[in-house]
Interface confidence: low
């Protein structure tokens, strides 16, 4: 639908299911005025999300979408929402008719054009649909992990995405495992990448007015054994009141199958260490990464006993990381004395 | 207890091929990086391969790289080392070791007792 | 070549003290924690040291360990016979991604 004055939808009733969706092309400096829901009680109109303001270039008012003078920036989704609930009366996506025949990846509407939809348009060279989604370029992964490459795209008749590797037709059937083409997502799936599959990945989008394409460049890094690695502050050092519960929490990443334990380091005999040079220490809890939320302690109706060091450990084939934090509590009826514990330690 | 048993090893011409396995027992297998050393007679110990606790992850060293594969079976508790193209320079006794930790009390690293490899004609 | 560096021998007489060095880069022993293994003739290396420092059970005091930096040291005190043996530094590179051995030392007590 394009418009010459004004693009407006008549009456202000809730439409059909079969206008629900809807893609109207509107001039540059054009005056915008929709309806949806009854005058009194009309909708309340949103653009990508963000509810519209009753006053302004672009308003949403008394359940009418009104834009004074159609602008690039004003293309995109809108939905009208009915008060007091969620039920979508109106979703609709206006395009900038401008910008019609144009294929400069920056100037395509935001939004993705359902082909499926009724209203008439004018032919038009592929566009991205949600160029945001493309924009991480690089994609270093581990090997054996799975990668995605998306180019979501739209234009008139419907394009066809087909992909290249490294600048030659790609099809998979040479890759172990070979690759899967999700046309309708517009998305190449490689499962259990390999450093083979190294290369640059470009999607090549066409129809009878244009083309369009972007390159994605894939690193696949070999994965290297290591001991794991823990978040850095974790656990935090944590002030608790007698009685409280109190979570220490542990991040821990490994590429080997981890094991963790929580540990309180205790005092025997008066020392904090033995002969053999560890510290004294009472195992709490010990798994591995697969348990049960084995990276959180948790620790209820705290004591006095229970302030002093606590200490994260993972450790797997290759080696053994671990870090303390200390837990000071505050007796009930004091609250506001606070002690100064000593900084969380980061041991090799 | 923790044990390691080597098989496999014996008298082999340049060129031929062999393959080394060590039967695991007393800790969990399928939980531990494997790795292979060898020691040539009367030299140091050279680390050869190791293999992840999955398998997924392979690393040789520059020595056999190309013509010797590790691998394992969790199902059998078995590490196997596939030994190609045989040189005079591998003759050697093959030690499977596995190496991690009883984490915070002390190591976890132990040896079999080798399999001794000779390369000649 | 080793990737890590030992002096080929050592020697003292009972009762002395006895270091060995080893040398490694920032890829091995600045990075990662040292073992050191002591080799009798005729059996597999057995762990003397682990972590840098740390003494496996039924491993005597006499035997310590330090490291600094990209170095790492063994040192046996009131040494005895028994201790003849080949010694032997290691840990895991991260550029090679495995485990790195010295030349082993070779220790004589006069």
């Known amino acids: 639908l394009e418009a010459s004055e004004e693009v407006e939808l008549e009456p202000c009733l809730a439409p059909s299911l079969e206008q629900q969706e809807q893609e109207l092309t509107v001039a540059l400096g054009q005056p915008v005025r929709l309806c949806c829901g009854r005058a009194e009680r009309g909708g309340h109109w949103y653009k990508e999300g963000s509810r519209l303001a009753p006053a302004g270039r672009v308003r949403g008012w008394r359940g009418r979408l009104e834009i004074a003078s159609f602008l690039p920036e004003d293309a995109g989704r809108y939905l009208c929402l009915a008060r007091g609930s969620m039920i979508v009366l109106q979703n609709l996506t206006l395009i900038t008719g401008d910008s019609l025949t144009s294929s400069n990846d920056d100037e395509d509407p935001k939004s993705h054009r359902d082909p499926s939809n009724r209203h008439s348009y004018p032919q038009q060279a592929p566009y991205w649909t949600h160029p945001q989604r493309m924009e991480k370029k690089l994609h270093a992964v581990p090997a054996g992990n799975t990668v995605k490459f998306r180019c979501p795209a739209a234009g008139n008749p419907t394009p066809t995405i087909r992909w290249l590797k490294d600048g030659q037709a790609f099809h998979g059937e040479n890759r172990i495992g070979g690759i899967r083409l999700r046309h309708q997502h517009w998305s190449l799936v490689m499962e259990s990448v390999v450093p083979s599959d190294r290369g640059t990945y470009t999607c090549l989008v066409e129809n009878a007015v244009g083309s369009i394409r972007y390159n994605y460049l894939l690193d696949v890094l070999e994965r290297s054994p290591h001991r794991p690695i823990l978040q850095a502050g974790l656990p935090a050092n944590t002030t608790a009141v007698v009685g409280s519960d109190v979570e220490l929490l542990c991040k821990v990443y490994s590429d080997a199958q981890p094991h963790i334990q929580w540990l309180k380091h205790i005092v025997i005999n008066g020392s904090s260490f033995g002969a053999d040079g560890f510290p004294y220490v009472q195992v709490l809890k010990t798994a591995d990464i697969n348990s049960s939320e084995v990276e959180v302690l948790y620790l209820r109706n705290v004591s006095a006993e229970d302030a002093g060091e606590y200490t994260c450990l993972a450790g797997n084939s290759i080696g053994l990381s671990y870090q303390s934090a200390w837990l000071t509590v505050l007796p009930e009826e004091d609250p506001t004395w606070t002690a100064a514990a000593p900084e969380a330690r980061y041991t090799d | 207890e923790v044990q390691l048993l080597e098989s496999g090893g014996g008298l082999v011409q340049p060129g031929g091929s062999l393959r080394l396995s060590c039967a695991a027992s007393?800790?969990?297998?399928?939980?531990?990086?494997m790795n292979w050393v060898r020691q040539a007679p009367g030299k140091g110990l050279e680390w050869v391969a190791v293999?992840?606790?999955?398998?997924?992850?392979?690393y040789y060293a520059d020595s056999v790289k190309g013509r010797f594969t590790i691998s394992r079976d969790n199902s059998k508790n078995t590490l196997y080392l596939q030994m190609n193209s045989l040189r005079a320079e591998d003759t050697a006794v093959y030690y499977c070791?596995?190496?991690?930790?009883?984490?915070?009390?002390?190591?976890?690293?132990?040896w079999g007792q080798g399999t001794l490899v000779t390369v000649s004609s | 070549q080793s990737v890590l560096t030992q002096p080929p021998s050592a020697s003292g007489t009972p009762g002395q003290r006895v270091t060995i060095s080893c040398s490694g880069s920032?890829?091995?022993?600045?990075?990662?924690?040292v073992n050191w293994y002591q080799q009798l003739p005729g059996t597999a290396p057995k762990l003397l040291i682990y972590?840098?420092?740390q003494r496996p059970s039924g491993v005597p005091d006499r035997f310590s360990g330090s490291k600094s930096g990209t170095s790492a040291s063994l040192a046996i005190s009131g040494l005895r016979s028994e201790d003849e043996a080949d010694y032997y530094c290691?840990?895991?590179?991260?550029?090679?991604?495995?485990?790195?051995f010295g030349g082993g030392t070779k220790l004589t007590v006069l």
């Open positions: 070791v596995t190496k991690s930790r009883d984490f915070w009390r002390g190591p976890f690293d132990y």
């Open positions: 007393g800790f969990t297998f399928s939980s531990n990086y």
């Open positions: 293999i992840s606790y999955d398998g997924s992850n392979k």
């Open positions: 920032s890829s091995n022993i600045g990075s990662n924690t």
């Open positions: 972590r840098n420092n």
């Open positions: 290691s840990t895991w590179d991260d550029s090679l991604r495995g485990w790195v």
